[in-house]
């Protein structure tokens, strides 16, 4: 299953697969997700360690038990890759690293004023995988404000050195977010030219095309077909570069079929993993495990529950089957790829969907009235699971907030349905940034179902906490998917890294604002808390979050939103937006309906409605 | 020029049968699975069934599975579809087509189709 | 097996008409998705395949996009020769599987 604690001072030894210079422990665990057989990693930040060759060393691990010894190394971080964690597996790292330099192929260099410029440039730019800026106070006058785009062989910083007023990042290309636009289409019968840079068996272009996107410098593919020329060469998926970022030349050629990588389309990229089955196709690789099971599908799903199997064949040959079971053969590859595809056999074959990150219908979980004022605009995909909660009676307007916690599933606030607790009246819009960009064309969803807690009474700020089941599932994407819910009662966890975000007010008196906005505030206790609110009880089951000195709170819009904090690099839905003294007013904090405390009726109500457990654990 | 051309089509009782063949040229028909494909009169279209490049692997639809049958004979480049217990329900415009992309991306080339009628 | 669906299932429209077909699929087939014109006596003629590729020799008029569960045939400016039944069909699982056809008549 899915793993997602880190241990820190704890660094696993042996199993190396592959090594690299990452920026943080994040990351690093990033590139062990979408490694074929990393399951473990160590990273050795700086301050760990003294040999300047090992610092920001990432170390990608495998084990055929999925586990390895640890043994104590002060500083070090070590984690689970993330296969198998559904939603939580992207390639988008937003973070820029203050004080670091990147190192590699430094290729384009420019003024611009910000650092935020230097990433959107990155971005934009077909090659570039990093970056590093030089700010105003940089010590050398002529390299202030430069703008460094850079690549590498792996895509990784071939070396990563601290470097006062320097900040470095990664393209946000994997996010989905490069302005650059992408080629869909395919070209039958027509191969490409230039730098080959890597080399995998797939059984068709479709898969060939998503292997691309995912490949750190791959920028078109040649595709040769399982009825090319030449037998050695059937089914070869060439991934390919060149200096221009297009193909040099194109050439006329019977059986092949080539195209270009997705990861410059904008909002939407295809998820790394490969769900088509392939009937009457073998795939050859290691063999891991061979299992009797009942159908291509089950066979499918064995392969994906047991983490280092990437493919699989089905086989429906007489001596392979007794009874209705059938043999299935759990496989895997140094590359992930098959090493061998066979056509017009009695077998079916595909691959593992360990990293689809559709993931399971469920909530998430791990086990470890009111807009924001002062804060700041948000950008795409920065806040996925955040959603409008609009009602369309004769106009149509935003009410409240939401967070998506799984396909079918937005936990809101109960005071949202006060006087409406109609079910067709409310439109869920999802996946969006600006509320102007929704027009009468823009998809939305329907509520199947309100529920509201059973001991919520209108206007008493207890127990503000209402789920809504959706008609239809929501797909995940980059900008749509869902929050972890914090584990029940979660007490011990401090938590530091908390944003409020909403469409509301921007003031006491204010409308409702245009961009989703976002702003970072500080948990206050409950007994500082209740020092504020003489007049109301604030117990245990909320959770309040403001500015002494106030300027910075949720407002009218707000409601029903997220308070989300970042612990051990993953966001947690702490808090449900709830109520306050106006906004932004000094010594009058925010409060929240506190998550934690409601978890067993998250699990209670989210199971029960359609009767089969709906919770997933990554931890 | 790649061509498919369907015949045996025809009118047969319920409970009788009909083997449909499908001839081809202009192509290296051993290299490319077959499929049939029919369509009843001013209906859409229906997968019936495909064969692989060899013969070695056949798949069909549920509507006709255990009653026809999908095989090919590369040395005649010839493809046929063995009909029996034949229901009304069968009625339709027969074609065989192929996808010669190697790449699951659509049948490329059809025959003219052959009508099939079941009727007492 | 996976259901295609098609809306509309007839349309009236005039040459020069832009024309929008569209084609839902009951659950994900990222690209695998094709679009074919049959005409009354003909046999079907594909016309995009991998949701939108255009199959050579077909005019440029015709464009297809979507991927996932929604998909759309577009012809940018409808010419007499495109009066025809349009199908979707979906090459992504076992079987393959047809939408209803989408009929487009002389206004």
């Known amino acids: 299953g899915c793993l997602t604690q880190l241990y820190e001072n704890a660094f696993f030894r042996g199993g190396d697969v592959a090594s690299m210079y990452t920026p943080n422990a994040q990351y690093c665990q990033m590139r062990c997700t979408f490694h074929p057989r990393c399951l473990l990693f160590s990273f050795l930040p700086a301050s760990s360690i003294n040999d300047m060759e090992k610092r920001f060393g990432c170390f990608l691990k495998d084990s055929v038990t999925g586990t390895l010894p640890k043994v104590h190394r002060t500083g070090a971080v070590s984690g689970h890759s993330l296969k198998q964690c559904g939603h939580q597996i992207s390639a988008c790292h937003r973070d820029i690293y203050k004080g670091v330099d990147m190192r590699g192929v430094n290729f384009n260099v420019s003024k611009v004023s910000s650092v935020e410029e230097c990433q959107k440039r990155c971005t934009s730019n077909i090659r570039c995988q990093f970056f590093s800026y030089a700010t105003q106070t940089f010590h050398k006058a002529e390299y202030r404000n430069n703008c460094l785009l850079k690549y590498s062989p792996g895509g990784t910083p071939t070396a990563i050195k601290v470097l006062s007023n320097v900040e470095s990042g990664f393209s946000l290309k994997p996010c989905a977010l490069s302005e650059i636009g992408c080629h869909m289409n395919i070209f039958q019968h027509l191969a490409f030219s230039d730098v080959d840079v890597a080399r995998v068996l797939t059984p068709d272009a479709f898969v060939c095309r998503t292997i691309c996107t995912y490949h750190p410098n791959c920028l078109f593919f040649t595709f040769y077909t399982n009825v090319w020329k030449i037998e050695s060469q059937r089914n070869v998926c060439l991934l390919k570069t060149s200096e221009s970022g297009t193909p040099s030349s194109s050439t006329p050629q019977e059986n092949t079929i080539s195209g270009y990588s997705l990861l410059t389309c904008k909002r939407t990229l295809p998820e790394p993993c490969h769900s088509k089955i392939y009937p009457g196709v073998d795939f050859g690789g290691e063999e891991l495990n061979v299992t009797f099971v009942k159908g291509v599908n089950v066979c499918q799903e064995t392969c994906t529950k047991m983490i280092r199997c990437q493919f699989f064949t089905y086989s429906l040959l007489p001596e392979d089957c007794k009874e209705e079971k059938c043999k299935c053969f759990l496989r895997l590859s140094m590359d992930g790829s098959p090493t061998r595809i066979a056509y017009g056999t009695q077998g079916s074959s595909g691959y593992s969907l360990r990293l689809c990150n559709t993931g399971d219908n469920s909530v998430c979980t791990t086990k470890t009235s009111t807009r924001i004022v002062g804060g700041t605009n948000s950008s795409w995909g920065e806040w996925p699971w955040q959603v409008s909660l609009q009602v369309k009676l004769t106009a149509q307007r935003h009410l409240c907030g939401g967070s998506l916690i799984g396909h079918q599933w937005v936990l809101t606030a109960a005071h949202c349905f006060d006087g409406l607790p109609l079910q067709d009246v409310w439109r869920i819009y999802s996946g969006i940034l600006n509320l102007s960009d929704i027009t009468k064309d823009t998809p939305f969803s329907q509520i199947k179902e309100i529920i509201i807690h059973q001991n919520y009474k209108v206007s008493e700020g207890n127990h503000d906490i209402a789920l809504i089941k959706l008609q239809a599932p929501l797909n995940y994407t980059e900008f749509q998917k869902p929050i972890c819910l914090p584990s029940k009662g979660d007490t011990s966890t401090i938590y530091t890294n908390c944003w409020v975000t909403g469409w509301g007010f921007s003031k006491e008196k204010g409308e409702i604002q245009n961009i989703l906005q976002k702003v970072n505030i500080p948990l206050v206790t409950n007994e500082e808390c209740q020092k504020r609110y003489q007049d109301y009880k604030i117990t245990q089951r909320m959770v309040c979050a403001g500015y002494k000195e106030g300027g910075k709170d949720a407002c009218k819009g707000d409601s029903g939103g997220p308070l989300v904090c970042k612990h051990n690099g993953m966001w947690r839905l702490v808090g449900i937006t709830s109520w306050g003294e106006g906004c932004a007013r000094r010594e009058q904090p925010g409060v929240y309906t506190k998550v934690a405390e409601y978890m067993d009726w998250i699990l209670e109500k989210t199971q029960s409605s359609d009767g089969k457990a709906q919770m997933q654990s990554p931890a | 020029e790649v061509q498919l051309l369907e015949s045996g089509g025809g009118l047969v009782q319920p409970g009788g049968s009909l083997r449909l063949s499908c001839a081809a040229s202009?192509?290296?028909?051993?290299?490319?699975?077959m499929d049939w494909v029919r369509q009843a009169p001013g209906k859409g279209l229906e997968w019936v069934s495909s064969?692989?490049?060899?013969?070695?692997?056949?798949n069909y639809a549920d509507s006709v599975k255990g009653r026809f049958t999908i095989s090919r004979d590369n040395s005649k480049n010839t493809l046929y579809l063995q009909m029996n217990s034949l229901r009304a329900e069968d009625t339709a415009v027969y074609y065989c087509?192929?996808?010669?992309?190697?790449?699951?991306?659509?049948?490329?080339?059809w025959g003219q189709g052959t009508l099939v009628t079941v009727s007492s | 097996d996976i259901q295609m669906t098609q809306s509309p299932s007839s349309l009236s429209a005039s040459v020069g008409d832009r024309v929008t077909i569209t084609c839902r699929a009951s659950?994900?087939?990222?690209?695998?998705l094709n679009w074919y014109q049959q005409k009354p006596g003909k046999a079907p003629k594909l016309l995009i395949y991998?949701?939108?590729s255009l199959q050579s020799g077909v005019p440029s008029r015709f464009s297809g996009s979507g991927s996932g569960t929604d998909f759309t045939l577009t012809i940018s400016s409808l010419q007499p020769e495109d009066f025809a039944t349009y199908y979707c069909?979906?090459?992504?699982?076992?079987?393959?599987?047809f939408g209803g056809g989408t009929k487009v008549e002389i206004k």
């Open positions: 087509a192929t996808d010669t992309s190697g790449s699951y991306l659509g049948f490329d080339y």
């Open positions: 202009g192509f290296t028909f051993s290299n490319y699975p």
């Open positions: 064969i692989s490049s060899s013969g070695g692997w056949t």
């Open positions: 659950q994900s087939i990222s690209s695998y």
């Open positions: 991998a949701a939108s």
């Open positions: 069909q979906q090459s992504y699982s076992t079987p393959p599987t």
